[in-house]
Interface confidence: medium
Amino acid sequence: PGPPAGSPRVSSDPRADLDSAVLLTRSLLADTRQLAAQMRDKFPADGDHSLDSLPTLAMSAGTLGSLQLPGVLTRLRVDLMSYLRHVQWLRRAGGPSLKTLEPELGALQARLERLLRRLQLLMSRLALPQAAPDQPVIPLGPPASAWGSIRAAHAILGGLHLTLDWAVRGLLLLKTRL
């Protein structure tokens, strides 16, 4: 007989859970790359753009050897929560120019929320603490101009793409160490 009704679900294979997190992250990476390319086509960027409120990059070639699952999942979740806030802000405050990308930004937000739920589930299955962000959440004010919102969109999508790219690589590597 199976576990009694109402009992907590027995943790599945963490590798399988990690697999599904990798698939979702890859899928979001592909979406972000596509949307960033659309942005570049519609609103060509003059040089590179950055936003002080975005998280700093957490991984590089040098950190791969010392990656630990708890640290990676916690940091990834915190960073993605920040990007989610930025995407929500972009949809709300982006102005008329960015409204043309509203369906794509909406879909991106939904996928981001789904990935965050999956990471939360994975962390609870692995009994990892659901850490809150270290830094205080900086309120995001309205962009200074329409051009300002376009520059912000370039920075947000570029940063999210980079974060997801490293996340896929890190999660794949950690899966082999489980």
């Epitope: 890859r26 990476l29 040089g47 590179d48 950055s50 990059l57 590089s60 070639a61 040098g62 950190t63 050897g65 570029g158 940063g159 793409h161 980079l162 790219d165 490293w166 896929v168 690589r169 794949l172 590597l173 082999t176």
Partner: antibody, heavy 117, light 110 residues
Framework: QVQLVESGGGVVQPGRSLRLSCAAS????????MHWVRQAPGKGLEWVAV????????FYADSVKGRFTISRDNSKNTLYLQMNSLRAEDTAVYYC??????????WGQGTLVTVSS | QSVLTQPPSASGTPGQRVTISCSGS????????VNWYQQLPGTAPKLLIY???LRPSGVPDRFSGSKSGTSASLAISGLRSEDEADYYC???????????FGGGTKLTVL
Amino acid sequence: QVQLVESGGGVVQPGRSLRLSCAASGFTFSHYDMHWVRQAPGKGLEWVAVISYEGSNKFYADSVKGRFTISRDNSKNTLYLQMNSLRAEDTAVYYCARTPGSHFDYWGQGTLVTVSS
Amino acid sequence: QSVLTQPPSASGTPGQRVTISCSGSSSNIGSNAVNWYQQLPGTAPKLLIYYDDLRPSGVPDRFSGSKSGTSASLAISGLRSEDEADYYCAAWDDSLSGVVFGGGTKLTVL
């Protein structure tokens, strides 16, 4: 748009040194790990070295370890490859490449290094 | 001798489907993403497939990648004359702490 432009190649005698540069533009250079990859005439691609985005971590192919040094100056958006004790087998086109994770998404046009007496 | 093994050549006629294989080990393909690059004659390599099967924007969907265990493959359907190029697979190798490439496959469109 993203651009990587290598320079510093040329003809050099065995045992001598050469420094290659790669000027980056169109993206936030300090956010990306950077690599050097080379290709000997008529041969395949060979990875040479990687440097992490902030410059503190470096990895090298066994064939160049102890002779080549990868470095970067984020304030100048430039990647370097210092090549010492050059050998004939180092003759190749040297490419710099940007990596957002595991792959090279942008490459320079390459600079030719010829090691010959 | 390359760490990843590819056939040196492949060929097909226009409209055909060709597949290029890439074989490695547990320390590279088995535990890391596989990427594919296309190098047209006289030019720098270009990213074709990343993370095993993802296509960068601008790469036609005629190109697809797949991976199983310690092997990967690149498939090109609806072959065109402009696909004539060298194709390289690559992956990070945990043992070597570096990127390893296949020897390259020269694709000829007959």
